[in-house]
């Protein structure tokens, strides 16, 4: 059985400020079992941005039903795109792990950039 | 406060056929997926079907596959479980559960008592 | 036949602790989750994904994991604690959730 691996197969999307973003990532396998996570940057300083697990994440939304249990797309739109949300955006699988989860394997990054609303 | 409330058991000759119904209040119905638990008198528990949150997606053990299918109307916060080809062996409480992210339980109704007899 | 095994009875004195383990899944694709349940009472979730606890379940229940065994460990125990306790698991690999056939907890005295 081959390794998991993450996949977010755009290196850079464009959108308009105000417009919703959508940011792809599938996983090759089901196992480990653990959650994915988005975050906006890398290293220790990274922002959140959704947890699969928990949290209330109101301009999130996920692509696919994730209570699939064969789901294995990660995939998420981020809604009312602003000029403050540019950067580089991570899909991270964690592995199941006591007391914290563990990351396992990221994805390669998505560049998000926002082309400001024409005045 | 998350409530389940089951409804629809009863008594049922062998061969024949129940519907079972879940009324589901206090949570977002439609973003949970939702499982069905039974327990036959004196024994443990076993899982007998799950549904994702959307619907469209079903899952079942080897024991009722085939005979049981689970089914919701979001509009309705209702889940179901069609129970057919019944048999000695189906008699037992039927438990609808709340799946947890990773689909494991966190709220359970208060059961139903299905009872398969001649 | 129950795919998860657990012992079939624990015994202990009020205020001892107690311990339930649980085996037979594969700790890559498996989660666990203990259930208590008292006499002509529904189910009632203690621990999810292997050892977390939910708010409203007081604090000496807790749930540790080690490879393919997961313990239900009951600090203090009361005479309320008396029931019965359900390991049940989420197995990734068949999608389907198996349980243990159940522990009966007996306090003492």
């Known amino acids: 059985e081959e390794e998991l691996q993450v996949i977010q197969p755009d290196k850079s999307v464009l959108v308009a400020a105000g417009e919703t973003a959508t940011l792809r990532c599938t996983a090759t396998s089901l196992i480990p079992v653990g959650p994915i996570q988005w975050f906006r940057g890398a290293g220790p300083g990274r922002e959140l941005i959704y947890n699969q697990k928990e949290g209330h994440f109101p301009r999130v939304t996920t692509v696919s039903d994730l209570t699939k249990r064969n789901n294995m797309d990660f995939s998420i739109r981020i809604g009312n795109i602003t000029p403050a949300d540019a950067g580089t955006y991570y899909c991270v699988k964690f592995r199941k792990g006591s007391p914290d989860d563990v990351e396992f394997k990221s994805g390669a990054g998505t560049e998000l950039s926002v082309r400001a609303k024409p005045s | 406060e998350v409530q389940l409330v089951e409804s629809g058991g009863g008594v049922v000759q062998p061969g024949g056929s129940l519907r079972l119904s879940c009324a589901a209040s206090g949570f977002t119905f439609s973003s949970n997926a939702m499982s069905w638990v039974r327990q036959a008198p004196g024994k443990g528990l076993e899982w007998v079907a799950g549904?994702?949150?959307?619907?469209?997606?079903?899952y079942y053990p080897a024991s009722v596959k085939g005979r049981f299918t689970i089914s919701r109307d979001n509009s309705k916060n209702t889940l179901y479980l069609q129970m057919n080809s019944l048999r000695a062996e189906d008699t037992a409480v039927y438990y609808c559960a709340r799946e947890t992210w990773n689909h494991l339980f966190d709220y359970w109704g208060q059961g139903t008592l299905v009872t398969v007899s001649s | 036949s129950y795919e998860l095994t657990q012992p079939p009875s624990v015994s202990v004195s009020p205020g001892q602790t107690a311990r339930i383990t649980c085996s037979g899944g594969s700790y890559s694709s498996y989660y666990y989750a203990w259930y208590q349940q008292k006499p002509g009472q529904a189910p009632v979730t203690l621990i999810y994904?292997?050892?977390k606890r939910p708010s409203n379940i007081p604090e000496r229940f807790s749930g540790s994991s080690s490879g393919t065994t997961v313990t239900l460990t009951i600090s203090g125990v009361q005479a309320e604690d008396e029931a019965d306790y359900y390991c049940?698991?989420?197995?990734?690999?068949?999608?389907?959730?198996?349980f243990g056939g159940g522990t009966q907890l007996t306090v003492l005295g």
């Open positions: 049940g698991g989420y197995d990734q690999s068949s999608y389907t959730n198996p």
């Open positions: 549904i994702s949150a959307g619907g469209s997606d079903t």
């Open positions: 994904s292997d050892d």
